[in-house]
Amino acid sequence: MMTGTIETTGNISAEKGGSIILQCHLSSTTAQVTQVNWEQQDQLLAICNADLGWHISPSFKDRVAPGPGLGLTLQSLTVNDTGEYFCIYHTYPDGTYTGRIFLEVLESSVAEHGARFQIP
């Protein structure tokens, strides 16, 4: 039975040209995290393997940085970066947990972070 929940940074916004940290946290389970995949809608951004470390997709090598922790830092943001991001936790023995973050990249200088929320 999957008992864990993923807490994410929720709905967030950031300025064009700036950076943002995407964070997820798996709680309420003793399952071992073997790997975390970060996806942007249709694209695989990065992989963090518990034993082997990080790999960034060649498509995003220049704009994505690993961390902090199991999170992901997006740099040089453009309006096209607006959309859904998913952290996919591969765990043993539970299986897969997925968290969702919605990022809005704003042209203006007003960019406020949204509240945290949980996805079971």
């Epitope: 809608q41 249709d42 695989l44 082997l52 470390g53 790999h55 060649p58 498509s59």
Partner: antibody, heavy 119, light 107 residues
């Protein structure tokens, strides 16, 4: 059992077009990123195209950019490679391959289909 | 583009002996390197990913090492089925590139 079966290869004249297909089975096709790789006779491997799970993004090397188009039909579990303005140097065995779900490497390959560009 | 240079082009080894294959990248690729085995008339088979991780079902006699620009594939004790061509590949940046291959033949 994972299977990738390429088809559509053959003899084509320089400047001509060809469409390759890769029928996938034994796994949930829409959950995987896919590649086309080619190998000229007696030569090494060359990456040709990459497509994301839903088909929204594609990537190519300069050698085929603007001439080749990778696409997919997830409802039909099929990957395609449309090849236009073919040149003699495009002669090769073309393989479709599946990206692993834990890395950016290719864990399953088809047996390939031969494309010969010659007049 | 990142050039992957493999050496030697051909390696003659007796069954039971150790084989060491080299792959050098023209720039730092971290650990974004894979090794594939290809036998005549067959498609390539993934052996090693992440420079040192063995793919599922790959025998323990195959091991990979290295990071940055220098990588090694070692076959600890060659079996008859290991005689083939081996390719390294980098997936650090586009275009994805392969080495020219090392043919491991029976001595």
């Amino acid at each position: 059992e994972v299977q990738l079966v390429e088809s559509g290869g053959g003899l084509v004249q320089p400047g001509g077009s060809l469409r390759l297909s890769c029928a996938a089975s034994g796994f949930t096709f829409s959950d995987y990123y896919m590649y086309w790789i080619r190998q000229a006779p007696g030569k090494g491997l060359e990456w040709v195209a990459y497509i994301t799970k839903g088909g929204g993004s594609t990537y190519y090397p300069d050698s085929v950019k603007g001439r080749f188009t990778i696409s997919r039909d997830n409802a039909k579990n099929t990957l395609y490679l449309q090849m236009n303005s073919l040149r003699a140097e495009d002669t090769a065995v073309y393989y479709c391959a599946r990206q692993t779900n834990y890395d950016f490497t290719m864990d399953y390959w088809g047996q390939g289909t031969l494309v010969t560009v010659s007049s | 583009e990142i050039v992957m240079t493999q050496s030697p082009a051909t390696l003659s080894v007796s069954p039971g002996e150790r084989a060491t294959l080299s792959c050098k990248a023209s720039q730092d690729v971290g650990t974004s390197v894979a090794w594939y085995q290809q036998k005549p008339g067959q498609a390539p088979r993934l052996l090693i990913y992440w420079a040192s991780a063995r793919h599922t079902g790959v025998p323990a006699r195959f091991s990979g090492s290295g990071s940055g620009t220098e990588f090694t594939l070692t076959i600890s004790s060659l079996q008859s089925e290991d005689f083939a061509v081996y390719y390294c590949q980098q997936y650090s940046s586009y275009p994805l590139t392969f080495g020219g291959g090392t043919k491991v033949e029976i001595k």
